[in-house]
């Protein structure tokens, strides 16, 4: 908290500009006027402040709006956004796409990863929160924006907030902005994909769809499945175990089509592991891939779950 | 990945004008305000001038004030210093950069030696 002083004679700022450096933190607070500062934002980083000097104006901004920044201010910020806490931003109110990505990046130059970050900083991410809330719903633009400064933004979202995705949106989604995404996640966003992607041909279809496809019920891998698709191992590999396991060999065969070879690799592995105990292990071996686990011939296959259902 | 090349540097005599450049890439230019901070041999680091955003208003450090000029050119993400009435204390590594307060926003720099 800096100490109220008055304004030594003749250093009353006029406007902002790079005589301020040479003031100290206390003439700073008692010269520079907080409205003059509002309306000259823009110029604040184009000055060599010292971090210590960028929070002494920080703190006047503060006292001029203690409800918080209007946007006019808050889109010339610059590097006093890494001054702000979460506090200080749920304050906002951000509804300009061009303001959300004037502070991503600055942010983004700051941090110190040359990979962009899975997930948003404190600061940003309750940034992001207030823009989203303010818009109603993850727009494509939005999206596209989001997904382009942290690739696993889509994925550090809950179930719930993911169901405010419209499927319009889906259309800005690459398949690394899914990479941490888990199966609760998937869920939600598959039938929106599902629904983006309708209009689209086979091939075309599969290739937008792919990396949803941990979402995806038995059904649809079935229809997929006759469609000459060729999946790869490890696209497999993260669909949902109980999407799998009622696949028959055959309709695994089709789905995999050359690719079915790497079964053998992931024998071990969920969901192939569990899918391999509940196949005939005749049908099994008619892949010619050496999988064991199967259900020896003559044994009776008993659904225990269907059982529990009925009783 | 961020890059900024500085470029314009070389041995000029007193009292004669240079135009350096800076080619930047890696981020959204036009989001940054962008300055230029020189290091003379043997001295600290010396802050030169700085332009917003927009390019609608710059700034100097009194040594240079009158005499150079920085400009943008945001469609070829493109800084420039014009450098009037040069003088022997100009003789320096001339960087352009982001952040002023982090070197690890700085191009490598150029050179310019002022000499007779």
């Known amino acids: 908290e800096v100490e109220k002083t008055a304004c030594p004679s003749g250093k009353k700022a006029r406007e902002i500009d790079e005589s301020l450096i040479f003031y100290k933190k206390w003439e700073l607070e008692a010269c520079v006027d907080a409205a003059l500062l509002a309306t000259q934002m823009d110029r604040v980083n184009a000055i060599p402040f010292t971090y210590e000097q960028l929070d002494v104006l920080k703190h006047k901004l503060d006292e001029l709006y203690p409800q918080g920044y209007p946007e006019s201010v808050i889109q010339h910020l610059g590097y006093l956004f890494l001054k702000m806490s979460p506090e200080d931003i749920r304050k906002w109110n951000v509804t300009s796409l061009e303001t959300l990505k004037a502070l991503l990046e600055v942010n983004k130059g700051h941090e110190m990863s040359p990979q962009a970050p899975r997930r948003p900083l404190p600061q940003v991410a309750t940034l992001i929160d207030r823009f989203v809330k303010g818009r109603g719903q993850l727009d494509k633009d939005t999206l596209d924006t989001l997904t382009a400064f942290y690739p696993g933004y889509l994925c550090s979202l809950s179930p719930e907030e993911l169901s405010s995705v419209p499927p319009s949106s889906i259309w800005a989604v690459r398949p690394q902005d899914l990479d941490t995404c888990d199966p609760r996640q998937l869920d939600v966003l598959y039938p929106k994909a599902r629904l983006a992607f309708q209009n689209m041909n086979g091939s075309e279809y599969f290739v937008k769809i792919q990396s949803f496809l941990g979402g995806a019920p038995t059904e649809d891998l079935k229809a997929l499945s006759q469609q000459n698709v060729s999946m790869d191992l490890a696209t497999f590999m993260k669909l949902r175990t109980d999407a799998v396991l009622p696949l028959t060999v055959a309709e695994v065969q089709k789905l995999l089509g050359p690719h079915v070879e790497g079964l053998k690799a992931e024998e071990r592995h969920r969901p192939v592991r569990d899918w391999i105990l509940r196949q005939r292990q005749d049908d099994l071996d008619t892949l010619g891939l050496g999988l064991q686990g199967g259900i020896p011939n003559g044994y009776l296959v008993l659904d225990l779950s269907m059982q529990e259902a009925l009783s | 990945e961020v890059q900024l090349v500085e470029s314009g540097g070389g041995v000029v005599q007193p009292g004669r004008s240079l135009r350096l450049s800076c080619a930047a890439s890696?981020?959204?230019?036009?989001?940054?305000?962008m300055h230029w901070v020189r290091q003379a041999p043997g001295k600290g680091l010396e802050w030169v001038s700085g332009?917003?955003?927009?390019?609608?208003?710059?700034f100097y450090a009194g040594s240079v004030k009158g005499r150079f000029t920085i400009s943008r050119d945001d469609s070829t993400n493109t800084l420039y210093l014009q450098m009037n009435s040069l003088r022997a204390e100009d003789t320096a590594v001339y960087y352009c950069?982001?952040?002023?307060?982090?070197?690890?926003?700085w191009g490598q720099g150029t050179l310019v030696t002022v000499s007779s």
């Open positions: 950069s982001r952040d002023p307060r982090r070197v690890d926003y």
């Open positions: 890696g981020f959204t230019f036009s989001s940054y305000a």
């Open positions: 332009i917003t955003r927009s390019g609608g208003a710059t």
